[in-house]
Structures are given as structure tokens and as C-alpha cells.
């Protein structure tokens, strides 16, 4: 017996699509071997029509695809635009066509349902609107107009021109009689339900001279689009429901049991707690279309998602919907990286951000996820030399260590820095990750003076005290600018006396500025690193003033002032800064969502809160 399983008989009608799922044991070999769909010939051979290695027969060109889902042990063959010629015996299988790992499938494509003569077929999606047109003759112009639905053997009145409406259609049906010139009435049914499907009869007049017209209404439940994304990666659901629902509340929900569909996010401000920090609902276009980005994909995110429109912001009968089946591939190309980084007030964090190593030249970005309204992610820094004004001197994006990872350093932490941050690039949109910064109790490890004033033309020495835990780390000083932090020469002054219970391995490393000029004014960082991996940093602002008295300045911790006032973050520090987005590809596939740099709503951005790994703020 073959271990492959699938549908033995598939019956469809011309013009339709089929989606055939074949199940296989998900062993390592099976997951990666060739998958195929072939048609059995009269002499017993099986001619490949499509395979997972990219082959598509000319018979299937432009109308079929084969998708492998190794995690589930399934592959799916989609075939569209069916004709009766597609009827026949097929095999879905693994490996080579002639070997035994296959399953026989019979596909029968018929002309369609037997309909009464002169029956008009209306095929409409669930939740949409249908207009059934009913012609009549002049002698019935003044007579009663009605629409019946065939229920079993009996016609049941749905609506008529005297004002009757069947309770099942209340609030969503109307009968329109055209002007005197046109011998036509029409029945418009909104918010179509699956139960509305069936045979209808419209009638003008009630006697033997009445005009009758048959209609067959088919209400289609949307086929879910199969979406296959990597664990820790990102998915974007594009939802286009049409202009008729442009002003109706939109939602994305995930089907749980049965018809229950739990709201993931909606435009009324609801968001499921499991998606906190890793979801954005992009502002909708005038045509009512919108998109939802979910990042940091977890195994449990797999499932069926529906987007729709309803005033309640959740799925109701008659909501127009679109559907997706999301599969999350655990054999992910996206590396694990810490999803939580902890830092202390006044201290720093160094965040590692993965990106697709094939796109080393892409622009790197870091943004702060904000949950207000539908979520947004204003940019804070990029690799092109832009830093949001309120973050000057305390935020830097470094291309190191490179080869698929960049580093973001944020220091002078306050409790307001706690939150979710997204790493993204203008390249592969699936490589968007998130990290949550948590501010915990404790003291910064590195000790530096608060702010320092240097005198023009003199020498300035600024100390940085490193505790013994960093004895094996490289210690450095650098001058911050918006493209990074340029290394400066520094002197090891021996053990530090700034730490209690710390031995000879503590260090005092000083920065010396000789013959200070105006250009020396700015932010200086001292920090630790191991190779290209950065650890904790501390920042000092050096102001430069005219000479008052001769001599050099040697700053000690005791003389340290508070950090300069102009750098204190006020409550408005997340306000939008009017900086235009330079690269339209950053949010490719979406309309330019926002007109300011800050509003690059991460519409194609991503997060990784997919695991509980944590990283301390100071060292790797």
C-alpha cells in the first residue's frame, strides 16, 4: 500500500478551480524529494503535468501550480479554468513517476448543473451584492412583481412589490421597478449568505399570463489563498473588499473552532494580546483595501485567517470576506535572535538584527512599534545616516557584524524606552524581526561623567570606568555622529577605584582630546565589544567654551553634572518629525502609506517575538 493519501474522486464544473491536497509521511527524505502531478495514459504511463522542481506542462501553463508544505507533510495542486478535457485519471506522488509512492485521483469535470431552460446563473461571493433582473411584458406593467425561492418542492415568497419582505432577507433586499420606458424590475440582495444560494423565480402578474424568469444564485465561500512563511518571519495579508465597503469597519480574524473567528486586529482599535508589538494594520485606500502585517511568526500563528468588513469590526453573517491559510515553516531560514533585551535606567542595550545576507547593500532601519489606533512604527534610525532628532547622541545603527546581522545601540535608557522595536530593511520584507526592550532595576555597568565642558585650545581627559566583568572585552571610546561612532584613541589608566568588590581587573580607560576645537563638541561613547559584537555603552556630552583660565581639564566622576537639558526626552519625544521617506521600495506592494519619514508605518515591517529568548543589555 502506498503511504500517499488524497481525494480519490474530485468533481467540478467547467470554468471552476480545484485544489487537490496530497498527504505524505513527513520524513526528512519525503519533505525534500520531488513532488509531482501526472495524468495516467491508456497504456499505463503517467505524463507529468506539474512538479515541485518547476516543470509545468504547456497544458497547464498559466493555470496551475504545485506548492509543497513540508512541515505538514502535504503538497497542493491548484488547477484553474477547468474544461471537460481535464476529466481523467491522475496521480499525485513523490520521487519518480514510475515508482510506487503515489495516489490515484479521478477528476471529473462536467458542464455544470442541469438548469431549467432560460435560467440566468448568478455567481457571487459571500457577503457581496447580487442584482437579479426580471423582464416582463407591457400587459403586466401594472401588476404585482414578486421573487420566489424554491425550497424543496415549494416556492417561498421572498419579496414583492406590495411591500412584503421575507424575514430571512430583512434589511438587505429591495425590489426596484425601472422607469416606464424599461419593462424590467430588479431585486437587489446585499450581504449575501451561503444560505441564499438556490433557485429563484421572478414573476410579474399572478394569472396565466404572468411573466416568469428563472435564476440560479450561487454564493461562493472564498477559497483560502495558501500562504507559506518562515518561523520568525513576517506575513502580509492584502485585503481588497471593494469600494462598496470603503467606509465600513475592517477586521482580520483567525478561525478557531467551527465558525468562530477571533479578531486579531480591526479598525475600531481592537487587537489580540498575542499580537502585541508585532502587528500593523495599514491605513486603507479610498477603494477600501487595506493590509495587515504580522511579524515574528510563531508556530501557533498557523491557521485560517479571514479579513472582512462589518460595522461591528468582527465576522458576521453576510460580511464580505477574503481568506488565507497560513502555514508556518519551522525549517526557517531566519536565524534565532533574542526577542527580549533588558537594560537598566541610564544604561544601554545592543540589539542584533538579522537580515537576508544576500541583501547586504540594502538600507537597514529600526523603528518603534506604537499600538495606538491600528499600530504604526515610526522610524528612529537608518543606515544612510538619518537619526530621529530626539535620539541624537544615544542611538546608532552599525552594519557590524555584517553577513546577515546589523547592530543597533541605544543608550541613556529611560523607562520610556521600554517597548517593541522592529528591525527591517528595504529589501526582503519577510526578514522583519522585533525585539522587546525591558527596563529593569539596576545600575549601569559603565561609569562616566554626566556632561563635560572643554576649553578651546586646551586638553581634555574624560574617564570611563569598566567593572571587572568586562576584563576580557575590548574597550573603546568613539565620537558619535549620525552615521555611527568613529573610534578614537584612548589610554588604559590601570585599575578603577569606582567599584566596590571589584579587583584589579576593573579598568579606567580615558579619552584625551588635545588642543580642543569647536569641532570636538558633541557626544562621545565609551563601550565594550568582542570582535564585531557590541556590548554596553555609556555616553558623555562634551561642550566647548572659550578659555577662562590656563591649564588642561581632567574630569572626574565627582564633578559630573546632570546630562544636558537639551537631550532630556520630554513626553512628546515620539512626535512625528517631518522627514520624507527617501526609498519608496521600503514598503513595496503598499501604497505610500505616509508622507513623513516617521510614519513609515512599518507596513512591510517585521518583529520576532516568536520565542522567549532573552538577552541582557550589557553583554553577549
Amino acid at each position: 500500500k502506498s503511504p500517499i493519501f488524497g481525494p480519490e474522486e474530485v468533481n467540478s464544473v467547467e470554468g471552476n478551480s480545484v485544489s487537490i491536497t496530497c498527504y505524505y509521511p513527513p520524513t526528512s527524505v519525503n519533505r525534500h524529494t520531488r513532488k509531482y502531478w501526472c495524468r495516467q495514459g491508456a497504456r499505463g504511463g503517467c505524463i507529468t503535468l506539474i512538479s515541485s522542481e518547476g516543470y509545468v506542462s504547456s497544458k497547464y501553463a498559466g493555470r496551475a501550480n504545485l506548492t509543497n508544505f513540508p512541515e505538514n507533510g502535504t503538497f497542493v495542486v491548484n488547477i484553474a479554468q477547468l474544461s471537460q478535457d481535464d476529466s481523467g485519471r491522475y496521480k499525485c506522488g513523490l520521487g519518480i513517476n514510475s515508482r510506487g509512492l503515489s495516489f490515484d485521483v479521478s477528476l471529473e469535470v462536467s458542464q455544470g448543473p442541469g438548469l431549467l431552460n432560460d435560467t440566468k446563473v448568478y455567481t457571487v461571493d459571500l457577503g457581496r451584492t447580487v442584482t437579479i433582473n426580471c423582464p416582463f411584458k407591457t400587459e403586466n406593467a401594472q401588476k404585482r412583481k414578486s421573487l420566489y425561492k424554491q425550497i424543496g418542492l415549494y416556492p417561498v415568497l421572498v419579496i414583492d412589490s406590495s411591500g412584503y419582505v421575507n424575514p430571512n432577507y430583512t434589511g438587505r433586499i429591495r425590489l426596484d421597478i425601472q422607469g416606464t420606458g424599461q419593462l424590467l424590475f430588479s431585486v437587489v440582495i446585499n450581504q449575501l449568505r451561503l444560505s441564499d444560494a438556490g433557485q429563484y423565480l421572478c414573476q410579474a402578474g399572478d394569472d396565466s399570463n404572468s411573466n416568469k424568469k428563472n435564476a440560479d444564485l450561487q454564493v461562493l465561500k472564498p477559497e483560502p489563498e495558501l500562504v507559506y512563511e518562515d518561523l520568525r518571519g513576517s506575513v502580509t495579508f492584502h485585503c481588497a473588499l471593494g469600494p462598496e465597503v470603503a467606509n465600513v469597519a475592517k477586521f482580520l480574524c483567525r478561525q478557531s473552532s467551527g465558525e468562530n473567528c477571533d479578531v486579531v486586529v480591526n479598525t475600531l482599535g481592537k487587537r489580540a494580546p498575542a499580537f502585541e508589538g508585532r502587528i500593523l494594520l495599514n491605513p486603507q485606500d479610498k477603494d477600501g483595501s487595506f493590509s495587515v502585517v504580522i511579524t515574528g511568526l510563531r508556530k501557533e500563528d498557523a491557521g485560517r485567517y479571514l479579513c472582512g468588513a462589518h460595522s461591528d469590526g468582527q465576522l458576521q453573517e453576510g460580511s464580505p470576506i477574503q481568506a488565507w491559510q497560513l502555514f508556518v515553516n519551522e525549517e526557517s531560514t531566519i536565524p534565532r535572535s533574542p526577542t527580549v533585551v533588558k537594560g537598566v535606567a541610564g544604561g544601554s542595550v545592543a540589539v542584533l538584527c538579522p537580515y537576508n545576507r544576500k541583501e547586504s547593500k540594502s538600507i537597514k532601519y529600526w523603528c518603534l512599534w506604537e499600538g495606538a489606533q491600528n499600530g504604526r512604527c515610526p522610524l528612529l534610525v537608518d543606515s544612510e545616516g538619518w537619526v530621529k532628532a530626539q535620539y541624537e547622541g544615544r542611538l546608532s545603527l552599525l552594519e557590524e557584524p555584517g553577513n546577515g546581522t546589523f547592530t543597533v545601540i541605544l543608550n541613556q535608557l529611560t523607562s520610556r524606552d521600554a517597548g517593541f522595536y522592529w528591525c527591517l530593511t528595504n529589501g526582503d520584507t519577510l526578514w522583519r524581526t522585533t525585539v522587546e526592550i525591558k527596563i529593569i532595576e539596576g545600575e549601569p555597568n559603565l561609569k562616566v561623567p554626566g556632561n563635560v565642558t572643554a576649553v578651546l585650545g586646551e586638553t581634555l581627559k574624560v574617564p570611563c570606568h569598566f567593572p571587572c566583568k568586562f576584563s576580557s572585552y575590548e574597550k573603546y571610546w568613539c565620537k558619535w555622529n549620525n552615521t555611527g561612532c568613529q573610534a578614537l584613541p584612548s589610554q588604559d589608566e590601570g585599575p578603577s577605584k569606582a567599584f566596590v568588590n571589584c579587583d584589579e581587573n576593573s579598568r579606567l580607560v580615558s579619552l584625551t582630546l588635545n588642543l580642543v576645537t569647536r569641532a570636538d563638541e558633541g557626544w562621545y561613547w565609551c563601550g565594550v565589544k568582542q570582535g564585531h559584537f557590541y556590548g554596553e555603552t555609556a555616553a558623555v556630552y562634551v561642550a566647548v567654551e572659550e578659555r577662562k583660565a590656563a591649564g588642561s581639564r581632567d574630569v572626574s566622576l565627582a564633578k559630573a553634572d546632570a546630562a544636558p537639558d537639551e537631550k532630556v526626552l520630554d513626553s512628546g519625544f515620539r512626535e512625528i518629525e517631518n522627514k520624507a521617506i527617501q526609498d519608496p521600495r521600503l514598503f513595496a506592494e503598499e501604497k505610500a502609506v505616509a508622507d513623513t519619514r516617521d510614519q513609515a508605518d512599518g507596513s512591510r515591517a517585521s518583529v520576532d517575538s516568536g520565542s522567549s529568548e532573552e538577552q541582557g543589555g550589557s553583554s553577549r
Partner: nanobody
Framework: QVQLVESGGGLVQPGGSLRLSCVAS????????MAWFAQAPGKEREFVAA??????????YYADSVKGRFTVSGDNAKKTLDLQMKDLKPEDTALYFC??????????????????WGQGTQVTVSS
């Protein structure tokens, strides 16, 4: 209240035939997949056959043990499911359950992929 009611079970001789029927009422949807499972005394429920609907396409699935002997059919709109059983064998003796689910996805052979269940109808094949 959702109800799936099976009928058509009974005692039949080996080689004989039976037709099982299932009618669903109170379902909040036109079911997208319905199936038959069999449970022999002291054993787990086993998949027998299923039918799934997507739009105007139907998909029929069978267990290896019943291929060529059993035929599944149904009406999505009427929420009915039938199982025509021919050439019955003593090992087909079991309590036959009807199951339904709103979506035609997931492996149809796995009982956990169905939300609604009937009470069962007994089929006994014995001479």
C-alpha cells in the same frame, strides 16, 4: 442546537449491502466537510470516508479498507451525507459516526479535524 442524526444501520449478512444516512440540523454553516468514522468495540474511531466541498467542487476520500466497496455522497446545501456500503464483511461491524466541519482543510482522516459529531448508528455484519 447542533444535531447530526445517523440512520440506516442494522444487521446484515456478509456480502450484503446497507445505506447509511446523516442529516445535520442547527449547523451555523453549509458544512464544508462531512465524514463517516467507524468504532469497533474496544478500538479507536477509524476513518471510513469523507466528502469535502469548496464552491462547486467536491472531493471524496476513502480508507484503503473500503475502496471499491463503499461510496460516499452528500448534499452541501441540504447538509446531508450518505454512505452506500456493499460487499460487507464481518470486520466492518462497528458503530458508524457522522462528523461535520465548517472548513475543508486539514487531513480528513483525523477525527480531531471535525467539530460536530452524531451519536452513531450500529452496523453488524454477521451470518
Amino acid at each position: 442546537q447542533v444535531q447530526l442524526v445517523e440512520s440506516g444501520g442494522g444487521l446484515v449478512q456478509p456480502g450484503g449491502s446497507l445505506r447509511l444516512s446523516c442529516v445535520a440540523s442547527g449547523l451555523p454553516f453549509s458544512s464544508s466537510r462531512m465524514a463517516w468514522f467507524a468504532q469497533a468495540p474496544g478500538k479507536e474511531r477509524e476513518f471510513v470516508a469523507a466528502i469535502g466541498w469548496r464552491g462547486r467542487t467536491s472531493y471524496k476520500y476513502y480508507a484503503d479498507s473500503v475502496k471499491g466497496r463503499f461510496t460516499v455522497s452528500g448534499d452541501n446545501a441540504k447538509k446531508t451525507l450518505d454512505l452506500q456500503m456493499k460487499d460487507l464483511k464481518p470486520e466492518d461491524t462497528a458503530l458508524y459516526f457522522c462528523a461535520a466541519h465548517p472548513n475543508d482543510d486539514g487531513d480528513p482522516r483525523i477525527s480531531g479535524n471535525y467539530q460536530y459529531w452524531g451519536q452513531g448508528t450500529q452496523v453488524t455484519v454477521s451470518s
